[in-house]
């Protein structure tokens, strides 16, 4: 008898090379075979459970950056007046949540902020829980 | 043939809104369907393996806080003279371990410390290993 | 029918008590039943996917320490002029990668650096993905 295989874990790595003031960061998924999807510049959550979240990036200007998952809820991350980020967190997310950026800069002298090494990773920690596809 | 499902991962999120000097923090599990249990103000470990541990909170007074798992062993986290915590760690825990707080304050003018956003998350990282229920 | 068990997750905890200038840290695996292996002072990656990485240690001298996984790629961790480390990260690693230390000290008066509590943990986060053994 063949031992059972793991179904694929819900996870995604998105990259971002540009953020816009009063908007967010433009995210792209470099891999076609990710188990989670990007839609309207947000990562779509289909499975309830804890997620390991890693956020990295080096910014061309000082900015304030927040990562949200649901309207009316506090941010997953919130960084004020930084030029880089390297943070890890754990959060409980649920079906219908959407993970997206909000960015504020403190100058009007530039249109956008360049990002080197911009990377956001989400990894589901509770396979076997509720998922809706 | 139905593809195999993951058995539920051992994980828990507990909240704490109050810590007592020379004692610990009073933890409660907001969800009834957690796969790990709270007993005598401690989280009970049934499964051997690595655990991802997330600890957050904002305290009404400066305190020193440690998170222990076994008598005679060093703490999982140890924070000295802080008013907030936002930490992530990885530790190997085993059956019979119990995860609990110890708190010390540096003033005699109050008994209790109020906590906003007090949250402790444990997520087992080695399903398939030894568990005793 | 017996519910399916998880196959063991790829994970390892190595310890290091000594680092050598211009070289690395001598790593040993205290447990015989780890699911990952150490070879030539490197941790061998057999499975593609995200890894949770925890690095801790207290050093007898100030040093600069990097943790690499592939020639020509940036480090997983890079710490400059530190006497301790307690870091967590997430990285995508793949078959044929090797995780190893590089250390530089800033004194010629000693060859070896002693390490207390030196620990490196890797935990695979994408079971079910590609593995080569």
């Amino acid at each position: 008898q063949v031992p059972p295989q793991y179904p694929p874990i819900q996870s995604i790595r998105v990259q971002f090379t540009r953020c816009e003031n009063e908007k967010g960061c433009i995210i792209t998924s470099p891999s076609k075979d990710e188990t989670m999807k990007v839609q309207d510049n947000s990562i779509i959550i289909n499975c309830d459970g804890f997620y390991l979240i890693s956020l990295k990036g080096y910014f061309s200007e000082e900015l304030s950056l927040s990562l949200y998952y649901r309207k009316g809820r506090g941010p997953l991350f919130s960084l004020s007046k930084v030029t880089s980020v390297d943070s890890i967190g754990v959060a409980y997310l649920a079906f219908k949540d959407k993970v997206y950026f909000n960015v504020t800069t403190h100058s009007t002298s530039y249109k956008d902020i360049q990002v080197n090494g911009g990377e956001l990773i989400l990894i589901h920690q509770n396979p076997g829980g509720f998922c809706a596809y | 043939q139905v593809p195999p499902q993951y058995p539920p991962i051992q994980s828990i999120r507990v909240q704490f809104t109050r810590c007592e000097n020379e004692k610990g923090c009073i933890i409660t599990s907001p969800s009834k369907d957690e796969t790990m249990k709270v007993q005598d103000n401690s989280i009970i470990i049934n499964c051997d393996g690595f655990y991802l541990i997330s600890l957050k909170g904002y305290f009404s007074e400066e305190l020193s806080l440690s998170l222990y798992y076994r008598k005679g062993r060093g703490p999982l986290f140890s924070l000295s003279k802080v008013t907030s915590v936002d930490s992530i760690g990885v530790a190997y825990l085993a059956f019979k371990d119990k995860v609990y707080f110890n708190v010390t304050t540096h003033s005699t003018s109050y008994k209790d410390i109020q906590v906003n956003g007090g949250e402790l998350i444990l997520i087992h990282q080695n399903p398939g290993g030894f568990c005793a229920y | 029918q017996v519910p399916p068990q998880y196959p063991p997750i790829q994970s390892i905890r190595v310890q290091f008590t000594r680092c050598e200038n211009e070289k690395g840290c001598i790593i040993t695996s205290p447990s015989k039943d780890e699911t990952m292996k150490v070879q030539d002072n490197s941790i061998i990656i057999n499975c593609d996917g995200f890894y949770l990485i925890s690095l801790k240690g207290y050093f007898s001298e100030e040093l600069s320490l990097s943790l690499y996984y592939r020639k020509g790629r940036g480090p997983l961790f890079s710490l400059s002029k530190v006497t301790s480390v307690d870091s967590i990260g997430v990285a995508y690693l793949a078959f044929k990668d090797k995780v190893y230390f590089n250390v530089t000290t800033h004194s010629t008066s000693y060859k070896d650096i002693q390490v207390n509590g030196g620990e490196l943990i890797l935990i695979h986060q994408n079971p079910g993905g590609f593995c080569a053994y």
Epitope: T17, K56, S60, N116 | - | G74, S78, S80
Partner: antibody, heavy 118, light 106 residues
Framework: EVQLVESGGDLVKPEGSLRLSCVVS????????MSWVRQAPGKGLQWVAY????????SYTDAVKGRFTISRDNAKNTLYLHINSLRTEDTAVYYC???????????WGQGTLVTVSS | SYVLTQLPSKNVTLKQPAHITCGGD??????VHWYQQKLGQAPALIIY???SRPTGIPERFSGANSGNTATLTISGALAEDEADYYC?????????FGGGTHLTVL
């Protein structure tokens, strides 16, 4: 005063290797991203590689990917460019640059000449 | 990859305005930086974020950027402004330079 001093340029044969160094002073090295920019004789500027403040993020122009490696030693205030499998078209003056606002190349060294010829 | 197009050379009469252009697809949506390189010297930043001047750069240098063209303007060119001028942008974590324009002051 900000100073960037490159060294390591030389005459090398095709397929050879070199390591360029850039020692900096006058600013807190580990607070700034760095880049290498090159200029072939009589030609324009070409960006070569970028490295973040801590060395964990790097990027390269397509022409050098897999052959060049940028690195830094913050303790020694030194930026490096390891060059392998050299080609004649890699002949150029290589400038070390400090990144400023907007990832501009705010300060430049005087350059070091790499000549690839058989 | 993103391409920036500059005219190889441009002549200007002493004390007259000089306009150096840099073309790129929808370049107006990007931040453009300009560098001056005098003969035998390393380049130097003269304009950043389309139109901002670093400390020490004379007021006669200005910049603009919209549509598919960014422009560096020298309001009254001096002999010391004879040099090569390069535009630069970042695109997807990769930096791109224009081919450069050699400005001759007559």
């Amino acid at each position: 005063e900000v100073q960037l001093v490159e060294s390591g340029g030389d005459l090398v044969k095709p397929e050879g290797s070199l390591r360029l160094s850039c020692v900096v002073s006058g600013f807190t090295f580990n607070n700034y991203g760095m880049s290498w920019v090159r200029q072939a004789p009589g030609k324009g500027l070409q960006w070569v590689a970028y490295i973040s403040i801590d060395g964990r993020s790097t990027s390269y122009t397509d022409a050098v990917k897999g052959r060049f490696t940028i690195s830094r030693d913050n303790a020694k205030n030194t930026l490096y460019l390891h060059i392998n499998s050299l080609r004649t078209e890699d002949t150029a003056v290589y400038y070390c640059t400090k990144l400023g606002r907007g990832f501009t190349f705010g300060y430049w060294g005087q350059g070091t000449l790499v000549t690839v010829s058989s | 990859s993103y391409v920036l197009t500059q005219l190889p050379s441009k002549n200007v009469t002493l004390k007259q305005p000089a306009h150096i252009t840099c073309g790129g697809d929808n370049i107006g949506s990007k931040s453009v930086h300009w560098y001056q390189q005098k003969l035998g010297q390393a380049p130097a930043l003269i304009i950043y974020y389309d139109s901002s001047r670093p400390t020490g750069i004379p007021e006669r240098f200005s910049g603009a950027n919209s549509g598919n063209t960014a422009t560096l303007t020298i309001s009254g060119a001096l002999a010391e402004d004879e040099a090569d001028y390069y535009c630069q942008v970042w695109d997807s974590s990769v930096s791109v330079f224009g081919g450069g324009t050699h400005l001759t002051v007559l």
